[in-house]
């Protein structure tokens, strides 16, 4: 057992051009806090995957208000260390995610709002008991400077916190064959209790006579790397003198997944699919509960009353993410029909409808054309309670009785050029716009925005489990 400690030194604009705007303002004072998430091994995992080694949240930093006109300085930080206790052996290799969160303290509806400002991640090797390691990570235009270390909690010592120390039985020296416990020179290393031959580098024990393996090692004495093992008899063209490598015990042999998890082999190792309420490399960690307050921004924690059941955050409209931490641009979901203009008022969405349409989402088509006629082949278009004629080429006016230039009204938006055509006018759009009247901006990735998912949801997964 031991503790991983993280000390944040600074969070502010990184070097180079494009300094970020301060996240706080006179109108919207805010303060920062940090979250660290640790996972064993060097695996590339999604940010949302569980923090199997543990997680911690810092205190809130001092309230900060930007000085008008001043560049964003390093922001005031919370006091103290972030500490993540670990119960078992320190794995030696680990992945981390450090998130910088902003708590907005303006007088917005609902009290403080939380938003994720920056997220950095990395994979490191670290021996327990070593000195502080310093690091700098960049997230966009922001830079985070921090130090970290892992230390063992007595009586554990060693680079994996697996050796145990006990107070000396005699005042002057340790028992036969036992060394003093550096740095606790007044204590002695406890007698070896692991299974005889258990690898000191890759194995550890918590009970006498057992040998538990660190990640990447297997076998009764943790001496076999996962997925390969020396073979004693030759295979095929290989000779007995040269030896060979054959697949060793399968990584799923003996099912390393605890708590009913199911094991599946991966190219480099194995993967446990954990039952509801458990996570971690081997499903050994029981879940965060609702009592831990995991839902931000007014989210309601559902389920997760105890560590054996996972929780879900039901997010208020306007927020999404497994912890309701992401603000949604609800207008990006294009909720307004029939060309209505979307307004996100914070407390609600509003659609400003084009003429001829009504309803909360402009879904109702007003019938203005009943009994109306348009001359010269014009067609009646419903609109705003009064009929309008869409006239054939060369005609205009309320009832299409006047001869007209179809381009006279400058119908092409955003600098598009208008051409008269036998079937009507044609717009040649300026770069970056599209549509019959060049009314739609083309998104930077070349695709127009499509409705993704309703507010508070992940696409295709309305009830996201952590």
């Amino acid at each position: 057992a031991g503790v991983f400690e993280l000390q944040i030194h600074s969070f502010g604009p990184g070097p180079g051009p494009g300094a970020p705007r301060s996240p706080c303002s006179a109108r919207l004072p805010c303060r920062l806090f940090f979250r660290v998430c640790l996972k064993p091994g060097l695996s590339e995992e999604a940010a949302e995957s569980p923090c199997a080694l543990g997680a911690a949240l810092s205190a809130r930093g001092p309230v900060y208000t930007e000085q008008p006109g001043a560049p964003a300085p390093d922001l005031p930080l919370p006091d103290g260390l972030l500490q993540v206790p670990f119960r078992d052996a320190w794995p030696g290799t680990f992945s981390f995610i450090i998130e910088t969160w902003r708590e907005e303290l303006g007088d917005q509806i609902g009290g403080p709002a939380w938003s994720l400002l920056a997220r950095v991640a990395g994979r490191r090797r670290l021996a327990a008991g070593g000195p502080w390691a310093r690091d700098i990570q960049r997230a966009g235009a922001w830079e985070l400077r921090f130090s970290y270390r892992a230390r063992c909690e007595p009586p554990a010592v060693g680079t994996a916190c697996t050796r145990l120390c006990r107070p000396r039985s005699a005042p002057s020296r340790c028992g036969p064959g036992l060394r003093p416990c550096a740095p606790l020179e007044d204590e002695c290393e406890a007698p070896l209790v692991c299974r005889a031959g258990c690898s000191p580098e890759h194995g550890f024990c918590e009970q006498p006579g057992e040998c538990r393996c660190l990640e990447g090692w297997t076998g009764p004495l943790c001496t076999v790397p996962v997925s390969t093992s020396s073979c004693l008899s030759p295979r095929g063209p290989s000779s007995a003198t040269t030896g060979c490598l054959v697949p060793g015990p399968g990584p799923c042999d003996g099912n390393p997944c605890a708590n009913g998890g199911s094991c599946s082999e991966t190219p480099r190792s194995f993967e446990c699919t954990c039952p509801r309420g458990f996570y971690g490399l081997r499903c050994e960690v029981s879940g965060v509960t609702c009592a831990d307050g995991p839902c931000f921004n007014g989210g309601l924690c559902v389920g997760g009353a105890d560590p054996d059941s996972a929780y879900i955050c039901h997010c208020p409209p306007g927020f999404q993410g497994s912890n309701c931490e992401k603000r949604v641009d609800r207008c990006s979901l294009q909720p307004c029909r029939n060309g209505g203009l979307c307004l996100d008022l914070g407390h609600a969405l509003r659609c400003r409808c084009r003429a001829g349409f009504a309803g909360p989402r402009c879904e109702h088509d007003l019938d203005d054309c009943a009994g109306r006629a348009c001359a010269n082949g014009g067609t009646c278009v419903e609109g705003g309670g009064a009929h309008r004629c869409s006239c054939a080429l060369g005609f205009g006016g309320r009832d299409c009785r006047e001869r007209a230039d179809p381009c006279a009204a400058r119908p092409c938006a955003h600098g598009g050029r208008c051409y008269a055509h036998f079937s009507g006018l044609v717009c040649a759009c300026a770069p970056g716009y599209m549509g019959a009247r060049c009314e739609f901006p083309v998104h930077p990735d070349g695709a127009s925005a499509l409705p993704a998912a309703p507010p508070g949801l992940r696409p295709g997964d309305p009830q996201r489990y952590l």
Epitope: G110, G298, L300, C301, A348, L349, G456
Partner: antibody, heavy 118, light 108 residues
Framework: QVQLQESGPGLVKPSETLSLTCTVS????????WSWIRQPPGKGLEWISY???????NYNPSLKSRVTISVDTSKNQFSLKLSSVTAADTAVYYC????????????WGQGTLVTVSS | EIVLTQSPGTLSLSPGERATLSCRAS???????LAWYQQKPGQAPRHLIY???SRATGIPDRFSGSGSGTDFILTISRLEPEDFAVYYC?????????FGGGTKVEIK
Amino acid sequence: QVQLQESGPGLVKPSETLSLTCTVSSDSISNYYWSWIRQPPGKGLEWISYIYYSGITNYNPSLKSRVTISVDTSKNQFSLKLSSVTAADTAVYYCARITVTGFYFDYWGQGTLVTVSS
Amino acid sequence: EIVLTQSPGTLSLSPGERATLSCRASQSISRSYLAWYQQKPGQAPRHLIYGASSRATGIPDRFSGSGSGTDFILTISRLEPEDFAVYYCQQYDTSPLTFGGGTKVEIK
């Protein structure tokens, strides 16, 4: 100003299903979560269920096996069904709007008394 | 579920006096996700306070909320005749949403 109006029979026989509808005016039902709360005569408030237009629902575990909540966005209405009722289900039933800043209730209907009796 | 216990059950006071109503939770409520409501006979509840201490739109400033964790207070600084009613607290941290049993503020 948003208004909510409960409607449904005021008298239901034991073992039958209680059905109520809440009609929302002056706001789109798609903007909010919507909820049902009840209050037995002379007693306190009990949350029953809520729904979001996308289909997210949540139920009070004490009633979950008997409750169904649904939404009709085209009519701007949401509904409650409570099956196998007994006299203990006699209460004033309120529909309410859940705010966008948290799961509390900022607008309520005036309530409808449902009596379970043969 | 989080059980909310309100005390006292009944509070007998005169207009102009200060009322202090308590709401205690069976477990800590994260980020002070607690609301207060007022209910008069024959009427629906009226929302007063959210986030333990923020007043809802249109609520007079004689109503104030405080507290965090497990202990929350609703204070009415000077009782007006229209303030005599039943007051409920509600937590919105964890499902199921739960209400306290209510405190009746009656005229002495």
